[in-house]
């Protein structure tokens, strides 16, 4: 570590005095101190002498000696006071620039340490400091305003009491700059715009920042528009607004609009699309199939997407039959707006009953006219089965009627013993009926099919079962002949158990 002679931390001299500061190190050494006149520098190998034979108040300051070759970067310092009765302050800089919340050092150095007790910081023209100004003083360095705020950007003077009167330094201008967190904040309104040719439109691009130094512009398909800017300051932010007013839009006004703002931190941009149409429009669509099949007792939501301009003047859900004249309950219909021109309308149909199958229509109206979208709702039912014994063309026949939706498939089983349902171990014979006769098949109703099984001899102690199944489920009917050996008898002589 270099050594300074005289080996004192502070040296107090009078104006005009001769001052010699000598620094000695292991290698070459360098002096660093406040820029001031009349110093001469003499270097000789490992020592360096700083001297003046006419010290002035401007030589007041801290002089530091460093050894550039020292890897530890050691240094030594001495503070020189040149106490001038007429000049209590040596101001090293007349402008100080800091960012908000940094400490701001106002470098007015006291030329006489004795005056330290009577120092204060004031604003120019003797005005007091702003409230909440937190500061400290060091005779070596000056006044420090701690955690400086933008509002403290003022002109300051350092004051010292000399012989009962206050003596001021020259003024120091403090500039506290806002910390700019990033590019300006942007809004572009609306986010999307549709107009009919000839209508008026307005697009507003606004940017705001804590600092006034930023630019904003609105461009249409990359063309920067000539829009006069409005400026404002509120909520501690500078705001710049560009308003595009189009009295009568035409197709060339359509396209992409971008609001762009930039400052030293970078650039922000946001875009919107403007669509110009020839006339009003109203489009209805659904992501769902318009033909819906749901199992009875389950629920269904019917959803319609509406794209419209101008806005809707009316809309409703209607049940078109065929079962009853009931209408959907309003509480089951709800509307959500995705954005200005797109809406979703939902009709909730919980726990569907047989009478609720049929056509549901969504109707909407705007100045472009009426539009409707109709859903066809068919309910799925598991098969219901019944079997009877009868004679057809003199032949004994088991007749199975199965009703359900979708159309049921029919299988006959013959099994040993009397049972409610044939299991695999008991099955003697199986017949599939690929083409049962369709008895009824109306829209939104169950499909009823009939299958015939001609039986020459009804075997006692056997069961004949008709099974029907579809995608929803299955149903069956077991026919148990109760007889004493007769091959064929009219059906009223038999009992059958469902």
């Amino acid at each position: 570590i270099p050594v300074i002679e005289p080996s004192v931390p502070e040296l107090v001299v009078k104006p005009g005095a001769t001052v010699t500061l000598r620094c000695v190190g292991n290698g070459s050494v360098e002096w660093d101190g406040p820029p001031s006149p009349h110093w001469t520098l003499y270097s000789d190998g490992s020592s360096s002498i700083l001297s003046t034979n006419n010290a002035t108040f401007q030589n007041t300051g801290t002089y530091r000696c460093t050894e550039p070759g020292d890897p530890l970067g050691g240094s030594a310092a001495i503070h020189l006071y040149v106490k001038d009765p007429a000049r209590p302050w040596n101001v090293l800089a007349q402008e100080v620039v800091v960012f908000e919340d940094q400490d701001a050092l106002l470098p007015c150095l006291l030329t006489d340490p004795v005056l330290e007790a009577g120092v204060s910081l004031v604003r120019v023209r003797g005005r007091p400091l702003m409230r909440h100004t937190n500061y400290s003083f060091s005779p070596w360095h000056g006044f420090t305003i701690h955690r400086a705020k933008f509002i403290q950007s003022q002109d300051y003077q350092c004051s010292a009491l000399m012989g009962g009167r206050k003596v001021m330094s020259i003024s120091i201008r403090l500039k506290v700059q806002k910390v700019i967190p990033g590019p300006p904040a942007l809004t572009l309104v609306p986010a999307e715009l549709v107009r009919i040719r000839g209508e008026a439109a307005q697009i507003v691009c606004s940017a705001s920042s804590v600092d006034v130094n930023f630019d904003v512009f609105l461009q249409h398909n990359n063309t920067k528009l000539a829009i006069p800017q409005q400026s404002d300051f509120h909520n501690n932010r500078y705001q710049k607004v560009l308003t595009l007013n189009l009295d009568q839009v035409d197709f060339q006004h359509a396209g992409n609009y971008s609001c762009v703002a930039s400052n030293v931190q970078g650039k922000h941009s946001t875009s919107m699309f403007f669509r110009v149409v020839e006339s009003a429009y109203l489009n209805l669509s659904s992501e769902q199939n318009l033909i819906q099949e749901v199992t009875v007792g389950e629920g269904l939501n019917l959803k319609v997407m509406v794209e419209a301009y101008p806005g809707l003047q009316g809309f409703n859900w209607t049940y078109l039959g065929p079962f009853s004249d009931h209408q959907p309950e309003p509480k089951l219909a709800n509307a959500t707006t995705k954005d200005t021109y797109r809406h979703t309308f939902t009709l909730s149909l919980p726990r569907l009953k047989p009478s609720e199958a049929g056509r549901y229509s969504f109707l909407a109206r705007n100045p472009g006219g009426w539009r409707a979208l109709t859903f066809e709702l068919t309910l799925r039912y598991p098969p219901e089965v019944s079997v009877i014994w009868t004679f057809i063309n003199g032949s004994g026949t088991l007749l199975c009627a199965a009703s359900g939706y979708p159309q049921p498939n029919v299988t006959w089983l013959q099994c040993s013993g009397h049972t409610d349902r044939c299991d695999e171990a008991q099955v003697l014979q199986v017949w599939d009926d690929p083409y049962p006769e369709v008895l009824s098949q109306e829209p939104f109703h169950k499909v009823t099919v009939q299958s015939l099984l001609t039986v020459e001899t009804l075997e006692h102690n056997q069961t004949y079962e008709c099974r029907a199944h579809n995608s929803v489920g299955s149903g069956s009917w077991a026919f148990i002949p109760i007889s004493a050996g007769a091959h064929t008898h009219p059906p009223d002589e038999f009992l059958f158990t469902p």
């Epitope: 398909n221 063309t223 000539a226 006069p228 800017q229 409005q230 595009l244």
Partner: antibody, heavy 118, light 113 residues
């Protein structure tokens, strides 16, 4: 209908000043820059400068800096141009013109004739 | 400043003839961002204020007859009147709005024979 109505002709003496007006109607006055153009037989059309009606900030052709001063009165939707230290070279027709968003003059005033003569 | 040079300074044509006038700029008027030429053409009839004909070098203003066509790019531009009419008697000015100060050409005077 979008219109720019300019004040009437002016006959002024050399060294004097004149202030001509341009009243806008049929559109949002603060929504467009207002420009001023000089037309003299010798120099054809010359752009004088522009004013932002929101802020009053101006951009001048360097040739007219010190000669022309542009101002606006938002409450009456009127733009003004003051010409000072007039000489015979300032005798001309002065037009106000609205700058469209797409950088062309889409609406012009009828023009104000300024004659400088002793 | 950008200097705009128009030629010819005047020309006399008969009704129905095709008219071509030129405008040259001392530097390019083509904006690299949007690939548009910042040049406008105005028509000034005797005793009237100028009236916009064409902007962005080739976009005809609404209501302007389609016999007026603007063309060109960079520094060389042309206004063409395909079939001149008696009401086309006027002075035609080109103007750059690429940078301030905006500048005008000295005009081409069209006379009808």
């Amino acid at each position: 209908e979008v219109r720019l109505q300019q004040s009437g002709p002016e006959l002024v003496k050399p060294g004097a000043s004149v202030k001509i007006s341009c009243k806008a109607s049929g559109y949002t006055f603060t929504g467009y820059y207002m420009h001023w153009v000089k037309q003299s037989p010798e120099k054809s059309l010359e752009w004088i400068g522009e004013i932002n009606p929101n802020t009053g900030s101006c951009t001048y052709n360097q040739k007219f800096t010190g000669k022309a001063t542009l101002t606006v009165d938002k409450s009456s939707s009127t733009a003004y141009m003051q010409l000072t230290s007039l000489t015979s070279e300032d005798s001309a027709v002065y037009y106000c013109a609205r700058l469209n968003y797409y950088w062309y003059f889409d609406v012009w005033g009828a023009g104000t004739t300024v004659t400088v003569s002793s | 400043d950008i200097v705009m040079t128009q030629s010819p300074s005047s020309l006399a044509m008969s009704v129905g003839q095709k008219v071509t006038m030129s405008c040259k700029s001392s530097q390019t008027l083509l904006n690299s961002n949007d690939q548009k030429n910042y040049l406008a053409w105005y028509q000034q009839k005797p005793g009237q204020s100028p009236k916009l004909l064409v902007y962005f070098a080739s976009t005809r203003d609404s209501g302007v007859p389609d016999r007026f066509t603007g063309s060109g790019s960079g520094t060389d531009f042309t206004l063409t009147i395909t079939s001149v009419q008696t009401e086309d008697l006027a002075v035609y000015y080109c103007q750059q709005d690429y940078s301030t100060p905006f500048t005008f050409g000295s005009g081409t005077k069209l006379e009808i024979q």
